[in-house]
């Protein structure tokens, strides 16, 4: 008897949906793989007899249940199968976005990009998809704890009126309210202000 | 709402000619990879052509050199002009559409696709 696949899961972010497992203990010898997934009640194979212990399934609608089952197979046996199912649009993670900071004496200028979609030749991003895409910014002192949090309007913001010769921290996320889901955080930028530019009458 | 719609089927000799023509609304139609699927009574739903964003096409075997599909961005028409019909072409004719999709993947099958219309009915008689 063949065991089946252990820890089967689907690894997605930005709609690159990878189904991962893990080989089970078998002393006869090296098992292989067989990945399918469900498409109008037909199973259609994605990876068949594979060594590798994932399947990429990024083909998939993003929009649909889907269907995906895995199995071990040593010779002409077999393992059960083991299913999951998978709606892209609501469980792929939504990766960090970009972000560019500028300095402007007292001010922090940031603009922001949207992931872009995985393995898509053209330059679609996920706020193409989602319609009530928008970004958190969390910003701080570097070296303090208090964390401040805004939502902006547009792909950009401004924060103004920082302390001079100051380090400000920057992140920044994909937030989608519609769905209460949020993204990944990106990694801290960290920035020195310089003087305060206003003349005093 | 993406919304699909079908039209142009019917009652055709073996030999003639049909054109579909799949109306789409709801969204940037010039960013979705489309296709056009059949499925014939008891049998499964297959793959008939389909076209990129970028306008690549592909066809099952079984249509090539008889079928043509294009797209009209202008008018958000999606169409499958089918020639030399044979009566194993019978079917019900679907549009279907993914959005925001290149032509990475060259999808061809259902659940590649996320939206689809109703259908509409082509019937060939020899």
């Known amino acids: 008897m063949v065991p089946p696949p252990e820890n089967v899961r689907m690894n997605s972010v930005n709609f690159k949906n990878i189904l991962q497992w893990e080989s089970p203990a078998f002393a006869k010898g090296n098992l292989t793989f067989t990945a399918q997934y469900l498409s109008y009640r037909i199973f259609q194979d994605k990876c068949m007899n594979t060594t590798l212990t994932e399947c990429d399934f990024s083909s998939l609608s993003k929009y649909g249940d889907h269907t995906l089952r895995v199995r071990a197979e040593f010779a002409d046996e077999h393992s059960d199968w083991v299913n999951i199912t998978f709606c892209p649009v609501d469980d792929t993670i939504i990766g960090p976005p970009g972000m560019q900071v500028e300095v402007l004496a007292d001010s922090l200028h940031m603009r922001f990009l949207a992931p872009k979609i995985e393995n898509e030749y053209e330059t679609w991003t996920m706020k193409n998809v989602y319609n009530s895409w928008t970004y958190n910014v969390q910003y701080w002192k570097n070296g303090t704890d208090e964390k401040f949090q805004i939502t902006p309007q547009y792909d950009f913001e401004v924060l103004r009126n920082l302390e001079p010769w100051t380090t400000y921290c920057v992140q920044v996320r994909g937030f989608l309210p519609d769905r209460n889901k949020a993204g990944e955080w990106s990694e801290p930028v960290c920035e020195q202000t310089t003087h305060d530019e206003t003349v005093p009458s | 709402q993406v919304q699909l719609q079908e039209s142009g089927g019917g009652s055709v000799q073996a030999g003639g000619s049909l054109r579909l023509s799949c109306a789409a609304s709801?969204?940037?139609?010039?960013?979705?990879?489309m296709g056009w699927f059949r499925q014939a009574p008891g049998k499964g739903r297959e793959g008939v052509a389909a076209?990129?964003?970028?306008?690549?096409?592909r066809y099952a075997d079984s249509v090539k050199g008889r079928f043509t599909i294009s797209k009209d961005n202008a008018k958000n028409t999606l169409y499958l002009q089918m020639n030399s019909l044979k009566p194993e072409d019978t079917a019900m004719y679907y549009c279907a559409a993914e959005p925001y999709c290149s032509g990475g993947y060259k999808r061809t099958m259902v659940a590649e696709f996320g939206y689809w219309g109703q259908g509409t009915q082509v019937t060939v008689s020899s």
């Open positions: 709801g969204y940037t139609y010039s960013s979705y990879c």
């Open positions: 076209i990129d964003s970028d306008g690549s096409t």
